[in-house]
């Protein structure tokens, strides 16, 4: 029961985590910036992995997608890749884990197969979570180091002058969503791996038994002994009836005239 609960909880936690990773990847608020030096109105700038947006105090919002793939910083491309890999692995992990759930019966699937699938999905969730955490952390590091800031404050460009306005970009909501989602996916994956250990069928331990009759009048009754499964109450192969049968441990070393086995 505990194994099923652990597996089910791991699945749900991972599901929430992957949904969060997808949400974070799609969100525009990866970095945010408040402008107080704007001569017109309060303007709020924010950017995501795919587009940049500006929102005014009047409520007007305009977003534009990043214009080129080749011109984007390698770090941004790396973050995109990490998040997408995380989503893909997580999605595959979810698909595998659905079939691995103990509460779901599909054909005559062995417990060992379910255990393997649970372990596979667990590992996928762990890697997925790590990808998301890594991606978000790389982006956060980009913001902290202000890598885009040019040393020259003003320079002449084509068709006029360009002036870099000193600004500070802060962590957007998507970073926190990504960190939490990555963490949940990671925890879910660990839970699946733990559940896998409980799902793996234990080897049935059959002890060798020799039967001894105390007299010719005593007949062997089939089913008198039970093989140990590790779960029954008869775990020590105790005698169920006193018909002279003994386990190998209890066999006397001296011979008996009544021995026929």
């Amino acid at each position: 029961m505990a194994v099923t609960a652990c597996q089910g909880l791991g699945f749900v936690v991972s599901l929430i985590g992957i949904a969060g990773i997808i949400a974070a990847t799609c969100m525009d608020q990866w970095s945010t910036q408040d402008l107080y030096n704007n001569p017109v109105t309060a303007v709020f700038n924010y950017q995501g992995l795919w587009r940049s947006c500006v929102r005014e105090s009047s409520g007007f919002t305009e977003c534009r997608g990043y214009f080129t793939l080749l011109g984007l910083p390698a770090m941004l491309q790396a973050v995109r890749a990490l998040m997408i890999v995380g989503i893909v692995l997580g999605a595959i992990g979810l698909l595998v884990s659905i079939f691995a759930l103990k509460c779901i019966r599909i054909g005559s699937m062995e417990d060992s197969a379910k255990a393997n699938m649970t372990l596979t999905s667990g590992i996928m969730f762990i890697v997925s979570g790590l990808c998301a955490i890594a991606g978000v952390s790389v982006f956060a590091n980009m913001l902290v180091t202000n890598f885009w800031m040019s040393t020259a404050n003003m320079y002449t460009g084509m068709g006029g002058m360009v002036q870099t306005v000193q600004t500070r970009y802060t962590f957007g909501a998507a970073l926190f969503v990504g960190w939490v989602a990555g963490g949940l996916t990671l925890i879910g994956g660990v839970m699946m791996c733990i559940a896998c250990r409980g799902l793996a069928p234990e080897e049935t331990n059959y002890k060798a038994v020799s039967y001894h009759a105390s007299g010719h009048s005593v007949a062997y009754k089939p089913g008198g002994f039970k093989a140990s499964t590790g779960f029954g109450s008869n775990t020590k192969n105790k005698k169920i009836y006193d018909g002279g049968a003994r386990t190998e441990d209890e066999v006397q070393s001296y011979p008996s005239k009544h021995d026929y086995v």
Epitope: P39, S52, V54, E56, S58, T68, W148, Q163, T164
Partner: nanobody, 121 residues
């Protein structure tokens, strides 16, 4: 690279009108605002008018409603309609776009090369 192309300047008589336009082209992301500044000979560059993408405007108090700024978001173009021009309006007019590139390049002010407006009889 962003380029600003200004047009519409020239010589006009006092009381006349002119319409300046400034079109931005290139890899433009989030435009915070578009505006016009002017610099008269021997003076500091001063604000004329600014418009945001949402249509919020700010004007220099000295203009007394003679100038009107407008923008075309689809064309990334800003216009300045100047009416009742006076000799003191003679200056080089610069258009300005404040563009936010975020993680790709920070916040930048782009300036046109300027267009000469001369008000003289």
């Amino acid at each position: 690279q962003v380029q600003l192309v200004e047009s519409g300047g020239g010589l006009v008589q006092p009381g006349g009108s002119l319409r300046l336009s400034c079109a931005a082209s290139g890899n433009i992301l989030s435009i915070n605002y578009m505006g016009w500044y002017r610099q008269a000979p021997g003076k500091e560059r001063e604000l004329v008018a600014i418009i945001t993408r949402g249509g919020s405007t700010t004007y220099a108090p000295s203009l007394k409603g003679r100038f009107t700024i407008s923008g075309d978001n689809a064309k990334d173009t800003v216009y300045l309609q100047m009416n009742s021009l006076q000799p003191e309006d003679t200056a080089v007019y610069y258009c300005n776009f404040r563009i936010n590139f975020g993680i790709l390049g920070g916040l930048r002010d782009y300036w046109g090369q300027g267009t000469q407006v001369t008000v003289s009889s």
